[in-house]
């Protein structure tokens, strides 16, 4: 189920699956409800420890069953991923840290009124992920008021510095606030070039999509079909940057299908799930659990209400079934996409719907001038 | 809302309009989704206009203006007022509205938390209302959506503010000593909401006040945390199913 | 992916010294203590040496102490252990753990795959 | 020094039975609520990894079929079923009291 308390004064030991520099726990927590192995964190804010390197420190963690020891730690923040509750699965983050310096590569500066106006630009700007803003009081005369785009490998800032008279916040893309506008478009039979920033195995191209819009480093992708020549580069999709925003060359290519990350859509964004059953179909994966139930859909409820479940398979094997009650492969992978695609064979596989934003999930609850 | 600034697009998601079409069209009240099907407001809204036909409930919107003969709205299934509200009173001020259709939850059109039942421990700290009502007592209904930060009061002592009036538990009052930020007419039925443990709540819903924004005079909510039974029971019965966000 | 690689092992000695290092990579090393354990051919895992994530504080083993020294670069991702003095005794495989207690308790999650130092004449 | 004694040092077993490591030390390994006992397999001719931590938290990855028990003193590891994959040498490290120390080992073979 879904779980939103917070643990203050307490980390979690152990588990580790990742670890970054984070301004605060919701960010943290949002960090972790995204990642595909993550379900509970621990965050060390600036005021609770003595360490300089560990400040701001988020440490994202896995446990086979769900739960980890808690140490005490004054000051630490602790907590479980939202994986589960339904609409507050959400990548936009919306507040302004006063009083930080979040690093980066710094790629573009400009002379703006107010941090808002930062934020804003950091949102219009295809590569940026986050951003500093020296305010009108800020030491060095010659840096106020200036506004920093910033980007980093994972996204996240490189380092989260107190420094007065600064402040720092993420680009609202993940908010649908970006005025850029997105490539609905896919298309086939061509491949892009440029920078590969990850590689995973995908079913189609609309869910290899999906993982590029959430990303933090994808602007566009190159999927390759299940009929590709190469037969180890089957069902891999590639996702892209490149220095420009844009794929700076592309070519005709049978059986490959390209597009582009749509986080830069205004109003909508796809929900982080893929909800589709792909028939004859089998996701290879570590085995988290095998059930028998009645029916592919019962199979997807179920790996979605085990929370570390990522994909399922649903085998129609002779061998495989009792009576209308069929085995159910519940699995898990590091990347959270199969680790391999096999088709033709009897059954069904998918994703868990664990991360799709539409579930009901309980989460959280004589008159003068009436207004 | 006096004393407050604009919204940005998908600050407060829960956050409605209910708008009455009569010969023109105009907005009357706010109200905060709960659900995919369930609106939360005040019962005076309804005082004088009980028929579902006429209102139209626009969502995921922050501009009233925006707004065209073209923009989707909701409709409303049933009104649910509370049994124990009086048009005379101030008392039980609430009500659920069911909508004909489901909406679809986006970054724009999404539910707010309810409090745990009768919570009462919980302090908070960081509360904001919002609306598209007056920016001053003798105003007018403004465009873009308002929000405003307001901290709350005691029962206490918004009981010393209203001596005329009985502030029961089952409200929240909020406000300035000196006044300058507070609700006012046409934010009636909207959210007074507060973010604990990162987590927003609604935690008030609007209801009355002595004015707007004047000193020593709060403005008096409906404490939601006090109707969580009346609220599951209703949105339970009416299709069998929890519909809202109930907490964990 | 976490990474630990090891370097710096060989033949030495009595007496001689040694640098081992532990290049670190898929984590934010500066967020984690990390410590060297040792395993002498055919016995058993013997802690040897730790350090904070800031390199602030380190700890020793009795039978090091004074003789070996932790160190960290958290700019290069990389952990050191400077032997000096060495004895036979010290022959070992030496591996770099990295420790995600976040408490003075340790705990060593992930291991690099050892360097072998042989003290011998 | 705390001192970790396992039993038995070898432990022969048949593929599918259960087996059971025992782990004592010389003092109380509880503290602030937790137990910092940690078990650690290392197979032939690789390094060590993490198995169970904090008594009975099995790390990532690691079967359900490996269990961590125990309190004070007094310390088991349970496998349900022995499979091939599972020899190798058990080491049970606490890490309550400074320096944390391993015990000698238990090394799990088939019959």
């Known amino acids: 189920g879904c779980l939103t308390q917070l643990y203050e004064n307490a980390f979690f030991r152990g588990g580790d699956v990742a670890s970054m520099y984070t301004p605060n726990a919701q960010y943290c927590q949002m960090r972790c409800t995204f990642h595909p192995r993550c379900l509970l964190f621990s965050f060390l804010p600036a005021s609770s420890i003595n360490d300089m390197e560990k400040r701001f420190g988020c440490f994202l963690k896995d446990s086979v069953t769900g739960t980890l020891p808690k140490v005490h730690r004054t000051g630490a923040v602790s907590g479980h991923s939202l994986k589960q509750c339904g609409h507050q699965i959400s990548a936009c983050h919306r507040d302004i840290y006063k009083g930080v310096d979040m690093r980066g590569v710094n790629f573009n500066v400009s002379k703006v009124s107010s941090v808002e106006e930062c934020q804003k630009r950091c949102t219009s700007n295809i590569r940026c992920q986050f951003f500093s803003y020296a305010t009108q009081t800020f030491h060095k005369a010659e840096y106020r008021n200036n506004c920093l785009l910033k980007y980093s490998p994972g996204g996240t800032p490189t380092a989260i510095k107190v420094l007065s008279n600064v402040e720092s916040g993420f680009s609202l893309k993940p908010c649908a606030l970006s005025e850029i506008g997105c490539h609905m478009n896919i298309f086939q039979h061509l491949a892009f070039s440029d920078v590969d920033v990850a590689r995973v195995l995908t079913p189609d191209a609309f869910v290899c999509r999906t993982i590029c819009t959430y990303h933090p480093n994808c602007l566009f992708f190159t999927f390759y079909t299940n009929v590709w020549k190469i037969e180890s580069q089957r069902n891999v999709c590639l996702l892209k940057t490149s220095e420009s925003g844009t794929p700076s060359s592309s070519t005709p290519q049978e059986n490959t299908i390209s597009g582009y990350s749509l986080l830069t859509c205004k109003r909508t964004l796809p929900e982080p799930c893929h909800s589709k059953i792909y028939p004859g179909v089998d996701f290879g994966g570590e085995e988290l659990n095998v059930t028998f139930v009645k029916g592919v859909n019962v199979c997807q409820e179920t790996c979605t209400k085990m929370i570390r479940c990522q994909f399922f398979t649903y085998s129609l094997l002779p061998e495989d079934c009792k009576e209308e009650k069929c085995k159910c492969f519940l699995r898990l992978s590091m990347d959270g996409s199969p680790t391999r695609i096999a088709y033709g064979t009897q059954g069904s596989s998918g994703y868990s719907l664990r991360l799709c934003n539409t579930g009901d999930n309980s989460v959280c609850t004589t008159k003068t001038s009436t207004r | 809302i006096v004393g407050g600034t604009n919204s940005s697009w998908g600050e407060w998601p829960w956050q409605v309009s209910l708008q009455v079409k009569l010969t023109a069209q105009r907005h009357l009240c706010g109200g905060s989704l709960i659900g995919h099907q369930w609106v939360l407001t005040a019962a005076h809204c309804f005082d004088g206009l009980p028929l579902q036909d006429v209102w139209r409930i626009y969502s995921g919107i922050l501009n009233l203006s925006d707004i065209t003969k073209d923009t989707p709205f909701s409709q409303i299934k049933e009104i649910i007022i509370h049994q124990n509200y009086k048009v005379s009173e101030g008392n039980h001020d609430i009500a659920l509205i069911k909508l004909q259709a489901p909406l679809n939850y986006t970054e724009f059109q999404k539910p707010i938390c309810l409090p745990s039942k009768g919570d009462t421990s919980t302090i908070y700290t960081n509360c904001w209302v919002t609306g598209w009502g007056f920016s001053k007592e003798k105003g007018e209904i403004q465009n873009i959506l308002q929000k405003v930060n307001i901290p709350l009061v005691t029962n206490e002592e918004c009981q010393k503010r209203y001596q005329d009036y009985k502030i029961t538990q089952r409200m929240v009052c909020a406000g300035y000593k000196e006044g300058g930020k507070d609700a006012c007419k046409g934010d009636s039925g909207g959210p007074l909401v507060c973010k604990h443990n990162g987590m927003w709540r609604l935690v008030g819903i609007t209801s009355w006040g002595e004015g707007c924004a004047r000193r020593e005079q709060p403005g008096v909510y409906t404490k939601v945390a006090e109707y969580m039974d009346w609220i599951l029971e209703k949105t339970q019965s009416s299709d069998g199913k929890a519909q809202m966000q109930s907490p964990a | 992916e976490v990474q630990l690689l090891e370097s710096g092992g060989g033949l030495v000695q009595p007496g001689g010294s040694l640098r081992l290092s532990c290049a670190a990579s898929?984590?934010?090393?500066?967020?984690?203590?990390m410590h060297w354990v040792r395993q002498a051919p055919g016995k058993g895992l013997e802690w040897v040496s730790g350090?904070?994530?800031?390199?602030?504080?380190?700890h020793y083993a009795d039978s090091v102490k004074s003789r070996f020294t932790i160190s960290r670069d958290n700019s290069k991702n990389t952990l050191y252990l400077q032997m000096n003095s060495l004895r036979a005794e010290d022959t070992a495989v030496y591996y770099c753990?990295?420790?995600?207690?976040?408490?003075?308790?340790?705990?060593?999650?992930?291991w690099g795959q050892g360097t072998l130092v042989t003290v011998s004449s | 020094d705390i001192v970790m004694t396992q039993t038995p040092p070898s432990l022969p077993v048949n593929p599918g039975e259960p087996a059971s490591i025992s782990c004592r030390s010389s003092?109380?390994?509880?503290?602030?609520?937790?137990?910092?006992l940690d078990w650690y397999l290392q197979r032939p001719g690789q390094s060590p990894q993490l198995l169970i931590h904090?008594?009975?938290y099995r790390a990532s990855g690691v079967p359900d079929r490996f269990s961590g028990s125990g309190s004070g003193t007094d310390f088991t590891l349970k496998i349900s079923r022995v499979e091939a994959e599972d020899v190798g040498v058990y080491y049970c490290?606490?890490?309550?009291?400074?320096?944390?120390?391993f015990g000698q080992g238990t090394k799990v073979e088939i019959k």
């Open positions: 753990a990295t420790d995600s207690s976040g408490s003075p308790n340790p705990l060593f999650d992930y």
């Open positions: 898929g984590f934010t090393f500066s967020f984690y203590a």
């Open positions: 350090i904070v994530p800031s390199g602030g504080r380190t």
């Open positions: 003092q109380s390994l509880s503290d602030d609520g937790n137990t910092y």
């Open positions: 904090t008594l009975s």
């Open positions: 490290m606490q890490g309550t009291h400074w320096p944390p120390t």
